[in-house]
């Protein structure tokens, strides 16, 4: 059962499993829902009647029984991990600590004239955890707008102490506002020789790349296949870190798979959720319960159902024995890995299900594409919505991509005229217009926030949020798409559609099926030839064939470029501006999104 | 041993520039600032800039703005004072003094490791 | 600036006594000042900081006290190698300043 409020003056009795520092009750919550056993907290606030070496102490608790003895405490602060809720969960924090500082191992010390400055810093440097910085009244005048940039092997202050004049917080990489690049990359038969800070089991080399990415001291990986000549190290996923914090070394070696921490694009692919199935393959670990299974899969279930299992063994049933049900092992370790993985035995293993919420929901895979036609099928492209106005009469007006359960984006040259969000109706999970009916239900629009440099769509910074009134329930047929990594900045996208109920060609209507179109991106420098009177900048992207044939066109505006890159769609442009439809040598010129991640997240996650 | 090892004497002419190197040695270089003090014959001491050897930000006494010039060499530990436009009121022992460790926040501190200090004489 | 006055310029005292060298600031300063001693043809050496903290390796005869505008340097019992010149220091603002300096000499 999922238990949110916290507990006032109490305190949980026993079943401590780890004692880490955390600024708040709130934030040791987090700390608890993201390791792999803690299911229940109990922090200690600064109070005059607490010993203060206690303060900010964040005790991670388990228990069998999912619950412990309560007992009253003044400054005790008590509650149970998000890992028995269904909500979406994020370690984001933003929140700035004043009076706190945190401590770790000091690594870099630099003037920032202010404490985001600092923060960003931190959050733009591969190994910051966290930072203090001191403010222009610190009473010592040389560290005065001093920013201290600091790590630990936990990622958690190793203490945290009252000092005035100072402010403490935490990198924003978990937040997606990091510029460091995302290397998705994984380079076969390659070990990274530098040094280890842990070693896990894993089933392949992606498994591997995940569990370094959520390790808060893991720069990069090498995994060790179950081909690998030494058998004592197969499956074995090296997590590891350099103080450049890049591989110093590159070795050449056969069965070994190597690769990067993805935590500068995290929000954007999927790293907590490991979801595929190991044939003949067992994990081992500690035993939870053994239940009875109809197939694998069914025992993926009963293990994301039980919140203290980690990952599972299914052992198929023996012809006609216990009325085709097999055998399904759940199982938990100390750090959510298996501690041994064995080949040959005619298992079927795989992982709780339960942790694909700390994930973006957008890196959940869709329904395949229909190859071939311009018409879309339901559920083909989830993200895309129709928006409507009511005034004077009601019609399609601009399409729209849901990037959050309240968002929507879109142009800001859609709202051109429109006095009031009242008018605005947003329709997701849409593929026919026709399906609008007096009674078909709607998202109303709460504001329309458009960026305040936009003037004209030629001019660029033609780029809306809708705020929705009510919260978007993710479905097959409406679910948000990824934003693009700031860290993808280099990516060269070779997958991407534009898909819109606007016209065919220039002259025409609005259409009532969905359409779609692939269209290859066009270079800034290619499409400012195209476009000789206009200033294409890097704001912008551009898409189309050189021979014309395919575009977006009126009524497509708003609506989603969206490009698929290592199985994730991401929303690379909104439609926006172009000369005439579909011409050739006239690329149609979209908001280039990433530019705009930091706008958006501003928007998005005000308090 | 912690030390703070300075160039040696030097005579300029007056509007001749002068560079005074300091060495550190026994401790790590960019975690700690540097200062430059200055003390003519027979007079106290005065306070000329700061720089902090990580970054190489600097600050300047107000006095000696546009003339003084600090700098620093991390592969050898060593900060650099070059004061230009010399003139005969210049002529003092200039000295390199090691201040705030900046690698951890506290209140308080002094300039606790001194150089030998360099007499630098204008006179034409 | 923050301007520092020392008292008095110089201070006979025989050895054994105490001896109590006083600083001055022009506007406040919290506890941001340090004690040095210079003896003729070497480097100044740091005694106090923080107004009251004694340095590494310095002896307990020596304390500092104050806070704001008005500060003391005390040695509680002259030796024979305490007789050189006090320097105080402001550490509160930009640009750090000294006291003219206290010359303590045998009586």
């Known amino acids: 059962e999922c238990v949110t409020q916290l507990l006032k003056d109490t305190c949980f009795e026993g079943g401590d499993i780890t004692t880490v520092f955390t600024p708040s009750a709130k934030y040791c919550q987090v700390v608890c829902t993201y390791h792999p056993r803690c299911l229940l907290f109990t922090f200690t606030a600064e109070s005059p009647s607490e010993d203060p070496t206690r303060w900010f102490t964040c005790v991670l608790k388990d228990s069998v029984t999912e619950t412990l003895p309560r007992v009253n405490r003044t400054a005790a602060i008590s509650g149970y991990s998000f890992k028995q809720c269904s909500h979406q969960i994020s370690a984001c924090n933003k929140d700035i600590y004043v009076d706190l500082d945190m401590k770790g191992i000091n690594y870099n010390s630099s003037v920032a004239k202010s404490a985001q400055e600092c923060q960003e810093r931190c959050t733009d440097d591969v190994h910051c955890h966290f930072f203090t910085y001191a403010t222009r009244q610190f009473p010592s005048l040389e560290h005065r707008n001093i920013c201290l940039l600091k790590h630990t092997q936990t990622g958690t202050p190793t203490r945290i102490t009252k000092l005035d004049k100072v402010v403490s917080g935490f990198s924003l990489k978990s937040c997606a506002l990091s510029n460091l690049a995302c290397i998705r990359d994984i380079f076969p038969n390659t070990v990274f020789a530098d040094s280890n800070i842990d070693s896990v089991m894993a089933p392949d080399a992606f498994v591997c790349g995940r569990i370094c990415t959520h390790h808060p001291g893991c720069l990069f990986f090498t995994f060790f296949s179950q081909e690998w000549p030494k058998e004592s190290q197969r499956n074995l996923c090296l997590l590891k870190t350099s103080e450049s914090g890049l591989p110093s070394t590159r070795i050449k070696k056969s069965k070994a798979l190597s690769g990067f921490s993805l935590q500068s694009c995290r929000h954007s692919i999927p790293v907590f959720c490991h979801s595929s199935f190991y044939h003949d393959t067992d994990f081992l670990g500690e035993e939870l319960d053994i239940v009875a299974a109809k197939s694998h899969e069914a025992c993926q279930k009963l293990c994301t159902n039980a919140v203290r299992c980690q990952f599972f063994t299914y052992t198929p049933a023996q012809a006609s024995c216990n009325e085709g049900k097999g055998k399904c092992y759940l199982k938990l370790s100390s750090n959510g890995s298996p501690t041994k993985i064995l080949h040959g035995r005619g298992g079927i293993s795989g992982y709780t299900l339960r942790l694909c919420k700390m994930d973006n929901e957008c890196t959940t895979k869709i329904k395949p594409r229909i190859v071939g036609g311009t018409a879309s099928v339901r559920g083909e492209w989830p993200w895309q919505v129709t928006l409507h106005t009511t005034s004077p009469t009601q019609r399609h007006l601009c399409g729209g991509s849901i990037i959050g359960n309240q968002w929507i984006l879109t142009a800001a040259h859609c709202f051109y005229g429109v006095e009031s969000p009242k008018i605005l109706r947003v329709y997701s999970g849409i593929l026919n217009q026709s399906e609008i009916k007096e009674d078909t239900s709607f998202f109303g629009v709460q504001e329309i926030i458009i960026h305040d440099q936009y003037k004209m769509a030629e001019s660029g910074y033609d780029i809306a949020l809708l705020k929705l009134e009510t919260t978007v329930n993710y479905t097959d047929s409406q679910r948000p798409i990824c934003l693009p990594s700031k860290g993808d900045r280099n990516v060269i996208y070779t997958d991407c559609w534009v898909t819109g109920w606007g016209y065919r060609k220039l002259r025409d209507k609005i259409q009532n099926t969905l359409q779609k179109a692939k269209i290859p991106l066009v270079t800034n420098e290619e499409c400012q030839k195209r476009y000789r009177g206009h200033k294409i900048t890097h704001k912008m992207i551009c898409a189309g064939y050189r021979e014309g044939g395919k575009d977006a066109c009126k009524g497509d505006s708003g609506g989603p470029l969206s490009c698929k890159h290592n199985e994730v769609w991401h929303l690379v442009g909104i439609t926006s501006w172009g000369e005439g439809c579909a011409q050739r040598e006239r690329p149609g010129v979209y908001t280039n999104v990433v530019e705009y991640v930091d706008w958006i997240l501003e928007k998005t996650q005000a308090v | 041993e912690v030390q703070l090892v300075q160039s040696g004497a030097e005579v300029k002419k007056p509007g001749a520039s002068v560079k005074v190197s300091c060495k550190a040695s026994?401790?790590?270089?960019?975690?700690?600032?540097m200062h430059w003090v200055r003390q003519a014959p027979g007079q106290g001491l005065e306070w000329m800039g700061i720089i902090n050897p990580s970054g190489g930000s600097t600050s300047y006494a107000q006095k000696f703005q546009g003339r003084v010039t600090m700098t620093r060499d991390t592969s050898t530990s060593t900060v650099y004072m070059e004061l230009s436009s010399l003139r005969s009121e210049d002529t003092a022992v200039y000295y390199c003094a090691r201040g705030a460790y900046l690698m951890e926040l506290y209140y308080y501190y002094g300039m606790d490791v001194w150089g030998q200090g360099t007499t630098v004489t204008v006179s034409s | 600036e923050i301007v520092m006055t020392q008292s008095p310029a110089t201070l006979s005292v025989s050895p054994g006594e105490r001896a109590t060298l006083s600083c001055r600031a022009s506007q406040s300063v919290s506890s941001n000042l340090a004690w040095y001693q210079q003896k003729p043809g070497q480097a100044p050496r740091l005694l106090i900081y923080g107004a009251s903290t004694r340095a590494t390796g310095i002896p307990a005869r020596f304390s500092g006290s104050g806070s704001g505008t008005e500060f003391t340097l005390t040695i509680s019992s002259l030796q024979s190698e305490d007789f050189a010149v006090y320097y105080c220091q402001q550490f509160n603002d930009w640009p750090l300043t000294f006291g003219g300096g206290t010359k303590v000499e045998i009586k």
């Open positions: 026994g401790y790590t270089f960019t975690s700690y600032s």
